[in-house]
Interface confidence: low
């Protein structure tokens, strides 16, 4: 006859491990007893349990309450045992020794592998600002046994680097994602993906990128200077910019205070019916926590009387 077992039994932390040992004998052969021991290299043998055909299961004190026979029905030639609630310290080599009649003794070894699924954590890097060079966006750490795989899933262009630290019974893997921040990355997801044989599916943690920036400011409203004439109603200047965080706007006049009747409404400067008093240099100040920008324009309010007078003079002079 011969013993049937597995080379490796793999179990997830906290699960029950079935340690298989089945004697496939010839007709009429019987199993008298099965002895289970832990036999890690250099540490000698430590008895787990003795399974006797007549007296049943005897469990050594070190494994009291943790070693059982599989539930019935049981085959008298089956010397398998269950190790309850596997912990990392259970990982190692095990041996079953089977005493048979009349064939004698047989022994076989197996390795118990206890998978420790990782609990990943994602830590965002420092605040991202446009104009920085290569910057840490996030780091992701997962510890398990065996070492987990940590990768990144994102549309954002960047570089990754990983390092692992081996502990006595596990390994911690940290992967860092570095990028050169740009405004187009705002709101983009950066997902840490952790794979491990002890997980039914990959674990994913997503971080949404926030990149601080402030665009150059520009002022609209002066595209047609001829519209800026005395008496015109509804004239306005609008300051254009964008930023993250959203910017605030402030209007000033470079050559004096804002004229009375001019309304500041956020990014818009609204004028009452235009007079020559409204001519001047206007400045839009745009700012957020990241930066500030200025844009200035010169308003020159035309006097139609002066213009028509000039035209007459030109005609008469010709």
């Amino acid at each position: 006859g011969e013993l049937e077992t597995s080379d490796v039994v793999t179990v997830v932390l906290g699960q029950d491990a079935k340690l298989p040992c089945f004697y496939r004998g010839d007709s009429g052969e019987q199993v008298g007893q099965v002895a289970w021991a832990r036999v890690d290299a250099g540490e000698g043998a430590q008895e787990l349990a003795l399974l006797h055909s007549k007296y049943g299961l005897h469990v050594s004190p070190a494994y009291e309450g943790r070693v059982e026979q599989p539930p019935p029905p049981r085959n008298p030639l089956d010397g398998s045992v269950l190790l309850r609630n596997a912990v990392q310290a259970d990982e190692g080599e095990y041996e079953c020794r089977v005493s048979t009649f009349p064939a004698g003794s047989f022994q076989a070894r197996l390795r118990l592998r206890v998978l420790v699924p990782p609990l990943p954590s994602l830590n965002p890097g420092p605040a991202l600002e446009e104009g920085q060079g290569l910057t840490l966006a996030a780091s992701c750490t997962a510890e398990g046994s065996p070492a987990p795989s940590v990768t990144w899933d994102t549309e954002v262009k960047g570089t990754t680097s990983s390092r692992s630290f081996k502990h006595s019974r596990s390994a911690a893997v940290t992967s860092e994602f570095h990028l050169v921040p740009s405004r187009s990355m705002n709101g983009q997801p950066l997902t840490c993906v952790v794979s491990h044989p002890g997980l039914l599916q990959d674990q994913r943690i997503t971080h949404i990128l926030h990149v601080s920036f402030l665009a150059e400011a520009s002022v609209r409203g002066l595209e047609d200077q001829n519209l800026w004439h005395i008496g015109r109603e509804g004239a306005m200047l609008k300051c254009l910019s964008e930023g993250q965080p959203p910017p605030s706007y402030n209007w000033t006049r470079l050559d004096g205070p804002l004229p009375s009747g001019v309304r500041v409404d956020g990014d818009t400067l609204g004028f009452p019916p235009l007079t020559t008093e409204h001519s001047g240099i206007y400045v839009c100040h745009v700012s957020n926590e990241f930066s500030s920008r200025d844009s200035q324009v010169t308003v020159d309010v035309l006097d139609p009387q002066e213009d028509s007078g000039k035209q007459v003079d030109l005609v008469s002079a010709s």
Epitope: L134, S161, R163, S164
Partner: antibody, heavy 117, light 106 residues
Framework: QVQLQESGPGLVKPSETLSLTCTVS????????VHWIRQPPGKGLEWLGV???????DYNPSLKSRVTISVDTSKNQFSLKLSSVTAADTAVYYC???????????WGQGTLVTVSS | DIQMTQSPSSLSASVGDTVTITCRAS??????LAWYQQKQGKAPKLLVY???NLADGVPSRFSGSGSGTDFTLKINSLQPEDFATYYC????????FGGGTKVEIK
Amino acid sequence: QVQLQESGPGLVKPSETLSLTCTVSGGSITNYGVHWIRQPPGKGLEWLGVIWSGGSTDYNPSLKSRVTISVDTSKNQFSLKLSSVTAADTAVYYCARSGKWYYFDYWGQGTLVTVSS
Amino acid sequence: DIQMTQSPSSLSASVGDTVTITCRASQNIYSNLAWYQQKQGKAPKLLVYAATNLADGVPSRFSGSGSGTDFTLKINSLQPEDFATYYCQHFWGTPTFGGGTKVEIK
């Protein structure tokens, strides 16, 4: 003890493709990268690229259009192909091993490739 | 690419001297720097990784220091077998090497 050994033709004609093989022995290359690095005569070192045991690659951007690195894991062999060579590609070509970080703990002895007609 | 500037490009020293080689990165590379020794006609040999960690089998007279952009390789009590060319290399993104420092016998 891990050992790396480069092999391939010592002379390549201009505009042709340079092909080299790196054979790794004495250890597993699982979870390691095999890199190609070159050194023109009397000059400094230049990193060309890396391939990981799983087959993923990373190349030097300045040579990316011309470099291809591949692996035959069953033979523990890693190949470098550099296309459209010129005299400026004449160098000693090394293969080297690294972990996840790109510093190189084991190197081959190097092989001199001359580009000449 | 990050540029690595090594100085001096060559130096002369005697057995027993202390030698210092510096390497400057064009941007912050944190501690992602390695040092290699290369003898004529041979492959480079890793001396130091992650700026300060001595590689296996490297004598303790070698030491690395620095972080960010400025790094140093120091050889205490120079031995005859230490006359060689030394290279720094960053591994922060695409690796690049310094131009090398040749340590010659005075």
